[in-house]
Amino acid sequence: REELAQQYEAILRECGHGRFQWTLYFVLGLALMADGVEVFVVGFVLPSAEKDMCLSDSNKGMLGLIVYLGMMVGAFLWGGLADRLGRRQCLLISLSVNSVFAFFSSFVQGYGTFLFCRLLSGVGIGGSIPIVFSYFSEFLAQEKRGEHLSWLCMFWMIGGVYAAAMAWAIIPHYGWSFQMGSAYQFHSWRVFVLVCAFPSVFAIGALTTQPESPRFFLENGKHDEAWMVLKQVHDTNMRAKGHPERVFSVTHIKTIHQEDELIEIQSDTGAWYQRWGVRALSLGGQVWGNFLSCFGPEYRRITLMMMGVWFTMSFSYYGLTVWFPDMIRHLQAVDYAARTKVFPGERVEHVTFNFTLENQIHRGGQYFNDKFIGLRLKSVSFEDSLFEECYFEDVTSSNTFFRNCTFINTVFYNTDLFEYKFVNSRLVNSTFLHNKEGCPLDVTGTGEGAYMVYFVSFLGTLAVLPGNIVSALLMDKIGRLRMLAGSSVMSCVSCFFLSFGNSESAMIALLCLFGGVSIASWNALDVLTVELYPSDKRTTAFGFLNALCKLAAVLGISIFTSFVGITKAAPILFASAALALGSSLALKLPETRGQVLQ
């Protein structure tokens, strides 16, 4: 194996770095961009989709969770399969699963089917990161591997920018919708979901023009196929550099003898499904065996260390980046509540209300023979009030409640004042006629504040760019470990600044700082993961670690967001501790700079 690694490195040096790698860079970049988009889709559509699908808080939470769950399963599944079936083939299948279900999710109406489609879409895209980095690394010579893998990371950021820009451009346009009958509605947020499937679709199209990794062929004893691909790399680069006359000098390459080739069954043995069943079981066994070998004596220490680093990095990064917008919303809510107007003991008779009431509390009021027509109630509370001989028509409300109120001889026509909005209230001889249909839940809706999140995400993802460039340029100069540990320490320090963020703009600025600093850790971690494992375990290990990363993300998000409105100290302390632990673990890993790809 060592001999193969050395020879392969020499061949890649002969092939050079040129047009072939840059073409592959953009193709795989699209696949990585699709992953960057996926993380944001659900978060961006929730403010609009919650009304359409009538989502409760638990439904919304489940929708956010399901994407990570899908990506977790996908990373492990496709990562394991890519070491057995090939990088290109598995990436094509996983992206196809992603784009098909992302496409379907744009059209399905029910919450359950939307959830299912997003789950499978997540399973599909889960294969992107583990396969893309392994695949690209196998076309890169040692000299610039770290730098070019880091440039590839930039596409994840581009995916986030694309998602935020598209959300900003599409979702607020309610006009971009149509209705078929009374049941089928296609609103602008669905157009956004559809547009978010484009990177994946384009990646599939572009990937069909690319060859399989020659290193995978060699690991599986396919010498001729590997030679053909390497010749293609050489010839493409030489033609582009203006040396078409240069001949690919390699004639023979070492190959690994395959011991556990897929079991082949005679076609006359049993039914087709039995044959496929045996093949699937055999393949599953090999994938599982390969995964367990990552915990074998040779790799156990590395795997456990990497698990620690991936977990702590993900826990703090995802925890904080989801906690930020929640914290901003909390600050907005606190500010909004501070501006609430209170009207005590008012007595109103024979008055017609036909305007908007917002952010008010009416206490101990008496309303006689009043008409509330075409009224918009936004964050209004009526407490201990009496409504007698009143008439409500065409009233729409959000975050509005009637607490301990009494209604006598009152008529409600075409309102959305559903039962739960009357808390400990008495209705005497009162009638509800033609209540508004649709979602009976109070949804936060799609006000300016809801769209603000697109802009914040846009800024936050864009802020990663300087960190990405710096880390790419320094990756091969200072080494992966210094980059990882240094960036983690800087992230840890930037975490403490969060304590001083008491305004919306300060929090956004700190989000950008944290994202910009921590990206270098992610880049270093991706490069390290690729280089620490041999080619026959590379995507399996990467897939497993990426699955663990998604689990850590879910835990981080759950724990951090539970402190919103309670304390800022706990999430900052958790994140700092995790980052400190991660950087100390990272320093115990072996440096891979200057090594040939095993």
Partner: nanobody
Framework: QVQLVESGGGLVQPGGSLRLSCAAS????????MGWYRQAPGEQRESVAS???????TYADSVKGRFTISRDNAKNTVALQMNSLKPEDTAVYYC?????????????WGQGTQVTVPP
């Protein structure tokens, strides 16, 4: 006191049409809303369609595109044109009205008219 009288119910084949009418009489002050509810055997009364002053209409999702409500404010009458009828439209249809009197809103109901669409 206001009286509401419905007419036009009957038996109609699936896919057929029917027109229900309702006339209000008595001391009407300001007839703000007129509309229709229906009640199938063993079911709760459900909203069908209504029309408020200013020709603002509301329809239940189940009848949108098939039923049309119209109103003559001068005569205080309301009509419901029902097309593409289905067996699930079988019910007693009740006319209702909301009169905004000097003393507050008053809701009035008709006796109901039977509509049957055999399966």
């Amino acid at each position: 006191q206001v009286q509401l009288v419905e007419s036009g119910g009957g038996l109609v084949q699936p896919g057929g049409s029917l027109r229900l009418s309702c006339a209000a009489s008595g001391s009407i002050f300001n007839m703000r809303v007129m509309g229709w509810y229906r009640q199938a055997p063993g079911e709760q009364r459900e909203s069908v369609a209504s029309m408020a002053s200013g020709d603002k209409t509301t329809y239940a999702d189940s009848v949108k595109g098939r039923f049309t409500i119209s109103r003559d404010n001068a005569k205080n009458t309301v009509a419901l044109q029902m097309n593409s009828l289905k067996p699930e439209d079988t019910a007693v249809y009740y006319c209702h009205a909301v009169d905004l009197t000097r003393n507050g809103p008053r809701v009035y109901w008709g006796q109901g008219t039977q509509v049957t669409v055999p399966p």
